[in-house]
């Protein structure tokens, strides 16, 4: 059908909570395009109409609520005026008591899921809440160990939880809560965080933590386009440097002649006392030589590594 | 460091009151829970309730209700439980435990011994 | 009111042995639940937190694992300090139970 696949990394979900997922891929949704959402390769579009459970709203895709069954591989379909691109995303969906957080030891957790305060400075959690413009959300409440949080330390604004002269009893597990609106029904939405404390290192010198990849395999069928994120969360005076490196050369060194491996343009969001960047890796088309290669992402002094390799034969 | 430091033994006759304090330090003691336990002599641990020191906000479990006060002076950082209408099997060690997270830090633990 | 039914009530075990004991919850607490260990005369130490989690200072022959609402506390090799009784601590919601505790006696 002519359309180039593009494959993006697990997303893990809440069983009997709402979700939703855009399907913008930068530079591809720039233009004018249209977006349509099909499930696990079928031919049929996911429904767009508004009080089915599972629909399309605008580019993105909206569980009301997500379910156990719902696990699967959803495609968003990109078309502009001469291309066409497929977007793979894994939705994992797991069953989460309401004021957990962790989630069943599964690797690879977004920073979503993981935070960290900064100890003695005024810093700030956040409530990760990413729904389209017809989802309305209430005001949010937040949780430590199952207990509202409460005290002259924090204040709720808006999407985050403010602390202020934070100490080492800050450490432990929170939940955001939230209800969202959609067509006059009422959802609730709760998000689990892991919270750590860091001590600032003197001196600036600071050692960046890379939130993925976490040193792990990626399956990935031969000829088609991957994209794979470095996520770092670094002091916000940080000088560390961020790339893609292979055989210990930048990839943009590396493959200088065919350009087929890429870094992409770093980006950032700042947060009140640190910085979370993201870096890119794009193969425009995986060859048989991109295997068992431990394709490295460097952070300062930290380092963590991807190593693609082909989907097992299915017998099937 | 967090401590939590309790009040002495005491020895009280059945019918009478007993008020148990737990001072607290080296974190925001406005900011978590406090909790309370108790452990009859060779039992095992029963929770009883707990009080937030910022509101006052108490739950207690329900067969403490009406014999249970929980209340907080934020001056001393001191958390108080006070226990009525005692009886025979209210001799027991109590603890306070702090929720900075979930029951982190404890109380050395106070003997309360009813008797005739 | 979750009911916590731990197991064994009573163990006899060598220095060395690996050590395995077990609380079931009576409904849904995802992960929070503590391991506590308290020698005699002592007030409870909290070694597990939210099921997995070591507390700083303890040893790493202690371990924390959940299957559904079956919780396990693994000591992979028992030493001489580690004879005590072991409770865990549901606090998903409250009021909070504990288990009825599982004392480690030298064999």
């Known amino acids: 059908d002519g359309c180039k696949d593009i494959f993006m990394k697990n997303e893990i979900l809440s069983a009997s909570q709402p979700f939703a997922f855009n399907c913008t891929f930068p530079p591809i949704t720039s233009g004018e395009v249209s977006v349509t959402w099909y499930k696990n390769s079928s031919k049929i579009p996911v429904s767009k109409i508004i009080q089915s459970r599972i629909h399309q709203d605008e580019t993105w895709i909206l569980f009301l609520p997500m379910e156990w069954g719902d696990s699967g591989v959803y495609q968003c379909v990109i078309k502009g005026r001469d291309s066409c691109h497929r977007i793979h995303v894994n939705l994992t969906v797991f069953e989460k008591h309401w004021c957990d957080t962790s989630i069943g030891g599964l690797p690879n957790l977004s920073d979503e899921y993981k935070q960290i305060l900064h100890l003695g400075k005024d810093d700030s959690l956040t409530c990760h809440l990413h729904f389209p413009k017809s989802c309305v959300l209430g005001p949010i409440k937040w949780y430590k160990d199952c207990n509202e949080i409460k005290g002259e330390r924090f204040t709720v604004l808006e999407t985050r939880l403010l602390v202020s002269n934070v100490s080492a009893e800050d450490r432990g597990n929170y939940a955001c809560q939230a209800i969202l609106t959609h067509s006059g029904k009422q959802y609730e939405v709760l998000n689990g965080i892991t919270v750590s404390i860091t001590e600032r290192a003197g001196y600036g010198g600071s050692v960046p933590k890379i939130i993925y990849p976490k040193n792990h395999s990626i399956e990935v069928q031969l000829g088609t386009t991957l994209i794979v994120d470095c996520n770092v969360t670094d002091t916000k005076d940080n000088t560390n440097l961020r790339c893609w490196r292979v055989n210990n050369t930048l990839v943009d060194d590396y493959y200088d002649e065919s350009k087929r491996i890429r870094e992409g343009v770093e980006t950032h969001v700042s947060f009140r006392e640190h910085n979370l960047y993201t870096v890119n890796i794009t193969f425009l088309e995986v060859k048989m030589e991109d295997y068992g290669l431990p394709f490295m992402c460097h952070a300062g002094v930290s380092t963590a590594y991807i190593i693609l390799q082909l989907p097992a034969p299915d017998f099937r | 460091q967090v401590q939590l430091v309790q009040s002495g033994a005491e020895v009280k006759k059945p019918g009478a009151s007993v008020k148990v304090s737990c001072k607290a330090s080296?974190?925001?003691?406005?900011?978590?829970?406090m909790n309370w336990v108790r452990q009859a002599p060779g039992q095992g641990l029963e929770w009883m309730g707990m009080?937030?020191?910022?509101?006052?906000?108490?739950r207690l479990a329900q067969k403490f209700k009406g014999r249970v006060t929980m209340t907080v002076d934020k001056s001393t950082s001191t958390v108080y439980m006070e226990l009525s209408s005692l009886r025979s099997e209210d001799t027991a060690v109590y603890y306070c435990?702090?929720?900075?997270?979930?029951?982190?830090?404890w109380g050395q633990g106070t003997l309360v011994t009813v008797s005739s | 009111d979750i009911q916590m039914t731990q197991s064994p009530s009573s163990l006899s075990a060598s220095v060395g042995d690996r050590v395995t004991i077990t609380c079931r919850a009576s409904q849904d607490i995802g992960n929070a639940l503590n391991w506590l260990q308290q020698k005699p005369g002592k007030a409870p130490k909290r070694l597990i937190y939210?099921?997995?989690s070591l507390d700083p200072g303890v040893p790493s022959r202690f371990s924390g694992s959940r299957s559904g609402t079956d919780y396990t506390l693994t000591i992979s090799s028992l030493q001489p300090e580690d004879f005590a009784t072991y409770y865990c601590l549901q606090y998903a919601s409250s009021p909070y139970t504990f288990g009825q505790g599982t004392k480690v006696e030298i064999k």
């Open positions: 080296g974190y925001y003691f406005t900011s978590y829970w």
């Open positions: 435990a702090s929720s900075t997270t979930a029951f982190a830090y």
């Open positions: 009080i937030h020191p910022y509101d006052s906000e108490t």
């Open positions: 939210a099921t997995s």
